[in-house]
């Protein structure tokens, strides 16, 4: 597959919404800001992302929170929880 890293002009995601289901994996990686994703995790569950796309979103969160997700993100994981491994969950500091 072609390696593409720069977000195409006009495709930077201003918010997490259903238009993102039309993004290829590399476009999600390049055009979705991880901090934006973290603050709008509650929206992800309403959008039918493919499992492949969810892998990309999880990767972005993993990069943002290498020591484990904060509770604000964990509470809104929704069906992204299906992508979590036991190792991921062990990092969580849930009270």
């Amino acid at each position: 597959e072609v390696e593409k890293t720069a977000c195409p002009s006009g495709k930077k995601a201003p918010e997490i919404d259903e238009s993102l289901i039309f993004y290829k994996k590399w476009e999600l990686e390049a055009c979705v800001d991880a901090a934006l994703l973290a603050t709008q995790m509650d929206r992800v569950n309403a959008i039918p992302f493919t499992y492949e796309q969810l892998d990309v979103l999880k990767h972005k969160l993993d990069e943002l929170y290498p020591q484990g997700y904060p509770e604000s993100v964990i509470q809104h994981l929704g069906y992204l929880f299906l992508k979590m491994s036991p190792e991921d969950i062990r990092k969580w500091n849930v009270t």
Partner: nanobody, 121 residues
Amino acid sequence: EVQVVESGGGLVQPGGSLRLSCAASGITFSGNYGGWFRQAPGEQRELVASMSSALGTKYADPVKGRFTISTDTAKNTVDLQMNSLGPEDTAVYYCYARVRLSRGGWGSEYWGQGTQVTVSS
């Protein structure tokens, strides 16, 4: 067991039309989510058209005005009518079905094996 099967691919000349059909068993498109993805050589898979009661009908920008997605509830099929085809539409086209959970959110996903569409003179 859920099965999703595509049909209708083939070779077509530029400017021509094709109709793809997707039949599902073990899952109904009504109330869930059905879509068509495509994957061109050397590219990643991309959604071209989708429909669901929750989100309505959606199209990718490159196919708007040329492709039409529709569902036949009685036959439990999702069809993709493709008009004004060009070489850039050459790809393997995949049918996709996704379960809509009663509490909201989305459950299991199912893919067809894909059908080749080649646009060439």
